[in-house]
Each structure stands twice: as structure tokens, then as C-alpha cells.
């Protein structure tokens, strides 16, 4: 299973649920669904209030039980370490895969933290981060922001990923904007 890590804004916008949580239990495999279940302790929710309704406490995260079908494997054994988890809701359960955005909270830049807590949501409705995988590439629309990190270095470590968000400048136009300058 291979996938290009998304821009964190794309991960935020395409996910049903975005939370901060600690992985606290030993993974279990359900003998009916063949999904692996990790026990988590949620500390913050950034997206998904409406989707979850009253059941706003997520206690488990589910993933395929085999690597080759994009199952997520949690490598950290530190149960006090917080992770940003962006996943999909299926039948009220939080599902993630290898392709999901799951990252230690402490590894995120201050700008990314700001994005997840406040700013990325502003760009979800109108704006699209458009990956540029090879030169030449051109904008398909004024609401697209060309994401060129992959051309230069690892996509999740690039400047645009760590410091910028694709946000509306005016109706029908989105541009890269610094998250640094918006940090209080």
C-alpha cells in the first residue's frame, strides 16, 4: 500500500473527524470484521462535532488488520504522547489507514497546529490544494493553490506543508497564505 502524504489542509478538509489523542492500549483484532482496533484517549476535537452528535467521545480507532491493504501500524510505545489523527467515520466509528494523516502533535510546526485548531477549516469550502507532481503543472482554477513541496523534498516536510494554508483571498480566488503571521 503506497500513498503520497497529503498537505495537512487536505487531510483536515477530507476527514470527517480530526482529533488529538493518545494511543493507550494494546491493539486488538475483531474476529468478525478483521479490523484492528487501537484504544485511544481523546484530548481535543478539532473537527467532527456535527458528525458525531452527542457521542462526542471517541475511545477507539479502527484500521485494516494487514499492512498490504493499507492498515495503519502505530509504532510509538509512549502512551503519554499525543497524536493528531484525521480519519473517516464509518458507522459512527473512526477509521484510519496508512494514507491517513496521523502525526505526533509535537512534530507539527506551530503553523500547522494553528491550521488544525483554527485556520484550515476556512479554506475547506472554497479552496483546493492541488499537488504538482511533475513540471510543468498549471492551475486548473483560481480556487486552486499549487502544492510544489513534492518537487523539492518530502511532501510533509516542505515549506508549504509546514507553514502555509490555501485560503480565500476574494470570491473565486484562493492563494497560499502564511499561518505564521496569524499565530497569536
Amino acid at each position: 500500500c503506497t500513498c503520497v502524504p497529503p498537505h495537512p489542509q487536505t487531510a483536515f478538509c477530507n476527514s470527517d473527524l480530526v482529533i488529538r489523542a493518545k494511543f493507550v492500549g494494546t491493539p486488538e483484532v475483531n474476529q468478525t470484521t478483521l479490523y484492528q482496533r487501537y484504544e485511544i484517549k481523546m484530548t481535543k476535537m478539532y473537527k467532527g462535532f456535527q458528525a458525531l452528535g452527542d457521542a462526542a467521545d471517541i475511545r477507539f480507532v479502527y484500521t485494516p488488520a494487514m499492512e498490504s491493504v493499507c492498515g495503519y501500524f502505530h509504532r510509538s510505545h509512549n502512551r503519554s504522547e499525543e497524536f493528531l489523527i484525521a480519519g473517516k467515520l464509518q458507522d459512527g466509528l473512526l477509521h484510519i489507514t496508512t494514507c491517513s494523516f496521523v502525526a505526533p502533535w509535537n512534530s507539527l510546526s506551530l503553523a500547522q497546529r494553528r491550521g488544525f485548531t483554527k485556520t484550515y477549516t476556512v479554506g475547506c469550502e472554497e479552496c483546493t490544494v492541488f499537488p504538482c507532481l511533475s513540471i510543468p503543472c498549471k492551475l486548473q482554477s483560481g480556487t486552486h493553490c499549487l502544492w510544489t513541496d513534492q518537487l523539492l523534498q518530502g511532501s510533509e516536510k516542505g515549506f508549504q506543508s509546514r507553514h502555509l494554508a490555501c485560503l480565500p483571498r476574494e470570491p473565486g480566488l484562493c492563494t497560499w497564505q502564511s499561518l505564521r503571521s496569524q499565530i497569536a
Epitope: 491493539p27 483484532v29 468478525t32 478483521l34 499492512e67 492498515g71 501500524f73
Partner: antibody, heavy 113, light 111 residues
Framework: QVQLVESGGGLVQPGGSLRLSCAAS????????MSWVRQAPGKGLEWVSA????????YYADSVKGRFTISRDNSKNTLYLQMNSLRAEDTAVYYC??????WGQGTLVTVSS | DIALTQPASVSGSPGQSITISCTGT?????????VSWYQQHPGKAPKLMIY???NRPSGVSNRFSGSKSGNTASLTISGLQAEDEADYYC??????????FGGGTKLTVLG
């Protein structure tokens, strides 16, 4: 009581196809994941494939990926293994198992010219 | 494919206790509490003896017990009987390969 009965084994030429069936009884079939495990003559056990209770998730060993397809019909309480592009090394007794706890008696597949 | 490592054979006299080891890695035996043990008599299907490291299915004698330490699981048979003579296989969940078996151990009951 819980019972699994395999069928469909036999002699097939290299490159040929075969479809194994496993009829289940004595338990709520759709509530259990099912597996196929094989055992070459005089050798140990090798997991082949697994499928979730709903049939929505399927897993395969690297040695059979792209050649074998596991499926199930919960209305008929039956598990299947479609085997294509068979090779001599696929020769084995094939067991169906209820998530590896209850096993059938096995069906012999021989791949030879 | 590298299987879990078991001794090829073990033997013991009636009434004795024997232990069969099953060594894996942190991504299979060591990483999960999903180790099973199967008994297989010649020409027969495998029979589950132990699941989830140390649990016995109903109907299995309490002479059979399982344990795990680190990356190694063990099956102990106490009060060895002639009918215990068979092949024994360990099996573990493995995130990369889903399910992996040991190479099998032939248990011989002497005398």
C-alpha cells in the same frame, strides 16, 4: 454442532483453475471471519487467505496474491476460494477454518501435468 | 516465507511434562496476545488447543497450557499421554503477513 466441509479439490494442470467450496453449519456464519489454510504433502501449515464476516475485507498471503480470490455467500453459509494460474507449489490439502478455531477435514488439490 | 521458529521434535515419557517453544519477533508473537497452538494427528485436520496465548477452548484437557515471554510463546503438556503424540503448530497474528505459523514440532511419547 459446528461443522465445515470442503469440496472442489482434484487434479489440475499447471496454469489451470479450480474453485474450492466450504459449507458451514452449526453457527451464525456471517458473524465469523473465515480463512483458508493449506498444507503441502509432508510440510507445515501455511495461511492462504481470510475474509471478514460481511465479505467486505479480504486478505491474502503474498504467495497467492493476484491468483486466488476468497469470497463468501452468507445466504448459503458457504465460503469459496477461486484459484487461478495454479502452480506445482500450490499442491496441498486446503483447509477452511472459522477464524482458525474450527477446521474442516480438508480437500486435496494436486497441480501436475 | 520465514515462519515462527519451533524445535523440529521433542520427546517425553508418559507422565512427564514437556514444553514446546515458538519464537517470533516483536511484530508477531511479541507484539500481540494472539498466539494459538494446534495439535495435528497424521491424516487429520489441525485441532485448536490454546488461543490468545493461554486460553483453552472447552473440551481441551487442562494438561495443556500456554504462556508467552517477550517474543517467545510456549506450550506445556503435563502428565504426558500416548494420545498426545502428534505434530504441534504455533500460530500468531502478524500485521505484515496477517497470520503466520511455526514450522511444526513432532512430539514423540516414549515407551
Amino acid at each position: 454442532q459446528v461443522q465445515l466441509v470442503e469440496s472442489g479439490g482434484g487434479l489440475v494442470q499447471p496454469g489451470g483453475s479450480l474453485r474450492l467450496s466450504c459449507a458451514a453449519s452449526g453457527f451464525t456464519f456471517s458473524s465469523y471471519a473465515m480463512s483458508w489454510v493449506r498444507q503441502a504433502p509432508g510440510k507445515g501449515l501455511e495461511w492462504v487467505s481470510a475474509i471478514s464476516g460481511s465479505g467486505g475485507s479480504t486478505y491474502y498471503a503474498d504467495s497467492v496474491k493476484g491468483r486466488f480470490t476468497i469470497s463468501r455467500d452468507n445466504s448459503k453459509n458457504t465460503l469459496y476460494l477461486q484459484m487461478n494460474s495454479l502452480r506445482a507449489e500450490d499442491t496441498a490439502v486446503y483447509y477452511c477454518a472459522r477464524f482458525l478455531d474450527i477446521w474442516g477435514q480438508g480437500t486435496l488439490v494436486t497441480v501436475s501435468s | 516465507d520465514i515462519a515462527l521458529t519451533q524445535p523440529a521434535s521433542v520427546s517425553g515419557s508418559p507422565g512427564q511434562s514437556i514444553t514446546i517453544s515458538c519464537t517470533g519477533t516483536s511484530s508477531d508473537v511479541g507484539g500481540y496476545n494472539y498466539v494459538s497452538w494446534y495439535q495435528q494427528h497424521p491424516g487429520k485436520a489441525p485441532k485448536l488447543m490454546i488461543y490468545d496465548v493461554s486460553n483453552r477452548p472447552s473440551g481441551v484437557s487442562n494438561r495443556f497450557s500456554g504462556s508467552k515471554s517477550g517474543n517467545t510463546a510456549s506450550l506445556t503438556i503435563s502428565g504426558l499421554q500416548a494420545e498426545d503424540e502428534a505434530d504441534y503448530y504455533c500460530q500468531s497474528y502478524d500485521f505484515r503477513r496477517f497470520s503466520v505459523f511455526g514450522g511444526g514440532t513432532k512430539l514423540t511419547v516414549l515407551g
